[in-house]
């Protein structure tokens, strides 16, 4: 058993049929010694008396809010949550496995630049009685500070018969050094509580590996005289790190016909312009990637040829 | 050339070679070994790699003030990785194919380090750890980790040389 926060405790249980469970001793937070009784949740049934209460926690029915009273007065509460371990593996019932980039990916994180700011998100099908708490640091043995906001519901989607809820959180490294080569990864820890079930999820990454620039901006076409060719130009996204002579991007320009089956013409360039042939009903798209480190490409910015 | 006296390196040449290094480092990894990377665990060999840290002057402002600190750090890193790529981690079994990009990567590391420090000039080189031969079964995982680490190192070096070529070239 360990304390998650004041008056909230997590009991770690090996979860299998007829498991013995954990013996837990609760102590009433009071100077009083006599006449103390204990109840669980809304029940008025007295579970025991005295300053301490010993219980055997085996299942969710044994978890909940234990309250000690004297007379009609509430003295203190202890909320017990359960953390299940099945076959040596902690349960992951609350969050959905996003399976990208690999199986057992529950948290996904992205950064738009090297400033030390990043966003993480996760998915669940649970709509109520759900709370999240997020902590983060750079490194684990001698952690350096990363400040995370509160997790918020950022999207709702319908998937088949059930709804899926996306939560996200923004974090900022306290003393970011954008130009340095990271040697210690960022650690992100999410505590998830659904009713009386506790679970924790972690992710470890370097900012460089989660970079995904915003799409290029101000994408424009300029027809070239007496030619089917056009000059495409664009600019670095506003959110990208500066100076651009240091934090350089590379770009992919694609000409795509109306039909998905049509052959795509692609050009790669480090410049912010390119000359391509504009076919009728086609569109021109440009996306960006860090020039020197192969992290994610941005989403496409597109304009029609016509 | 970045000689200890403090004259300027051939920024444009260094930019071109460092960008090539980035490409090679990504094409060399993931190396197709003979098996999956099943053997996990941190290996000492990759814990000692030199990193370009915050105080090394490799940020745009630091380069403007005095690029020598940063160039010396990059030089140390290039020599370190060049030694690693020549060690039995890469020369031993499972053998790399003759056309593996690791050979080119190795040569390019040497080439850039020589551009930064021509014959006859000597910067203090960081102590290269005496690489005790790796157990053969550790080599695939070590290659994987070293190349991942090298990708990050050469990315910062390439940014430095790109910025230098754009803003510090005579």
């Amino acid at each position: 058993i360990w304390e998650l926060k004041k008056d909230v405790y997590v009991v770690e249980l090996d979860w299998y049929p007829d498991a013995p469970g954990e013996m837990v001793v609760l102590t009433c937070d009071t100077p009083e010694e006599d006449g103390i009784t204990w109840t669980l949740d809304q029940s008025s049934e007295v579970l025991g008396s005295g300053k301490t209460l010993t219980i055997q926690v085996k299942e969710f029915g044994d978890a909940g809010q234990y309250t000690c009273h004297k007379g009609g007065e509430v003295l203190s509460h202890s909320l017990l949550l359960l953390h299940k371990k099945e076959d040596g593996i902690w349960s992951t019932d609350i969050l959905k496995d996003q399976k990208e980039p690999k199986n057992k990916t529950f948290l996904r994180c992205e950064a738009k630049n090297y400033s030390g700011r990043f966003t993480c998100w996760w998915l669940t099908t649970i709509s109520t009685d759900l709370t999240f708490s997020v902590k983060s640091s750079r490194g684990s043995s001698d952690p350096q500070g990363v400040t995370c906001g509160a997790a918020t519901l950022s999207a709702e989607r319908v998937r088949g018969d059930n709804k899926e809820y996306e939560y996200s959180v923004e974090c900022q490294e306290d003393s970011a050094c954008p130009a340095a080569e990271e040697s210690l990864p960022i650690e992100v820890m999410v505590d998830a509580v659904h009713k009386l079930k506790y679970e924790n999820y972690t992710s470890s990454f370097f900012i460089r590996d989660i970079i995904k620039p915003d799409p290029p901006k101000n994408l424009q076409l300029k027809p070239l005289k007496n030619s089917r060719q056009v000059e495409v130009s664009w600019e670095y996204p506003d959110t990208w790190s500066t100076p651009h002579s240091y934090f350089s991007l590379t770009f992919c320009v694609q000409v795509q016909g109306k039909s998905k089956r049509e052959k795509k013409d692609r050009v790669f360039t480090d410049k912010t312009s390119a000359t391509v042939i504009c076919r009728k009903n086609a569109s021109i798209s440009v996306r960006a990637q860090d020039r020197y480190y192969s992290s994610s490409w941005s989403e496409w910015a597109s304009v029609p040829c016509s | 050339r970045a000689v200890p006296g403090g004259s300027s390196p051939a920024w444009t040449q260094c930019q071109q070679l460092s960008q090539k290094l980035c490409t090679l480092a990504w094409s060399a990894h993931p190396l197709v070994g003979h098996m999956d990377l099943r053997e996990e665990g941190d290996e000492e060999t990759t814990n000692d790699v030199p990193h370009i840290q915050c105080g090394d002057g490799c940020d745009p402002q630091g380069l403007r003030d005095n690029s020598q600190f940063c160039l010396q750090r990059i030089h140390q890193g290039l020599i370190f990785y060049e030694k690693l790529l020549g060690s039995d981690i890469f020369t031993g079994e499972p053998s790399l194919l003759p056309d593996s990009p690791v050979g080119q990567l190795h040569a390019s590391l040497l080439g850039l380090s020589q551009l930064l420090q021509p014959e006859g000039h000597h910067w203090e080189t960081q102590q290269i750890p005496s690489l005790s031969p790796s157990q053969p079964w550790q080599r695939l995982l070590l290659r994987f980790k070293i190349l991942r680490s090298l990708q990050a190192f050469v990315a910062v070096a390439a940014r430095v040389f790109a910025h230098g070529a754009a803003t510090l070239s005579p």
Partner: antibody, heavy 115, light 107 residues
Framework: QVQLVQSGAEVVKPGASVKMSCKAS????????IHWVKQAPGQGLEWIGY????????KYNEKFKGRATLTSDKSTSTAYMELSSLRSEDTAVYYC????????WGQGTLVTVSS | EIVMTQSPATLSVSPGERVTLSCRAS??????LYWYQQKPGQAPRLLIK???QSISGIPARFSGSGSGSEFTLTISSVQSEDFAVFFC?????????FGGGTKVEIK
């Protein structure tokens, strides 16, 4: 094509030393290790050690440490093994080979230790 | 050190028969195992690398299997030129060690 060509047979007296060579051709000498293997008459194979021609790094079987010395010369793409304090049980064929998974073997050098 | 044990020591077979040679390591060596064939007066020749990977130029009748500490070399239909001594080798950790060999002879 790849070849490892070893020096000729040697007859040496007990207590003396012998130095044999292994010249590589047909591949980049510094790219792979050179292992040395002993095979006594009618017996199995025993690994002596290897050298990394790129950096002269060596690894020895404890059994041969101190008596076997491995060296190489990049300029001639040649690896060498010196065996000292020879005794009769050192009579054997000694093979050089590149990485195990490449199947580049020398033809062997027969060393006979006899008074 | 890892001890490699081969069995049987000698195998008498007729051409065309299927032959199975066994090699056991004293501890797990994953799939870092090599099989060699050696004929009198010749250097060993690599038949199989990493327990089951074939070598170009080696006839397809030679195949390897196993992982961990138990390994097998199979000759699907033994030919007259296959009679020789076969060695297995630990390529997993130092010192590299070889099995004592299995001699495959004509019945």
């Amino acid at each position: 094509q790849v070849q490892l060509v070893q020096s000729g047979a040697e007859v040496v007296k007990p207590g003396a030393s012998v130095k044999m060579s292994c010249k590589a051709s047909g591949y980049t000498f510094t790219r792979y290790l050179i292992h040395w293997v002993k095979q006594a008459p009618g017996q199995g194979l025993e690994w002596i050690g290897y050298i990394n021609p790129y950096n002269e790094g060596t690894k020895y079987n404890e059994k041969f440490k101190g008596r076997a010395t491995l060296t190489s010369d990049k300029s001639t793409s040649t690896a060498y093994m010196e065996l000292s304090s020879l005794r009769s049980e050192d009579t054997a064929v000694y093979y050089c080979t590149s990485n195990w998974d490449l199947d580049y073997w020398g033809q062997g050098t027969l060393v006979t230790v006899s008074s | 050190e890892i001890v490699m044990t081969q069995s049987p020591a000698t195998l008498s077979v007729s051409p065309g028969e299927r032959v199975t040679l066994s090699c056991r390591a004293s501890q797990s060596i994953s799939d870092y195992l090599y099989w060699y064939q050696q004929k009198p007066g010749q250097a060993p020749r690599l038949l199989i690398k990493f327990a089951s990977q074939s070598i170009s130029g080696i006839p397809a009748r030679f195949s390897g299997s196993g992982s961990g500490s138990e390994f097998t070399l199979t000759i699907s239909s033994v030919q007259s030129e296959d009679f020789a001594v076969f060695f297995c080798q630990n390529g997993h950790s130092f010192p590299f060690t070889f099995g004592g060999g299995t001699k495959v002879e004509i019945k």
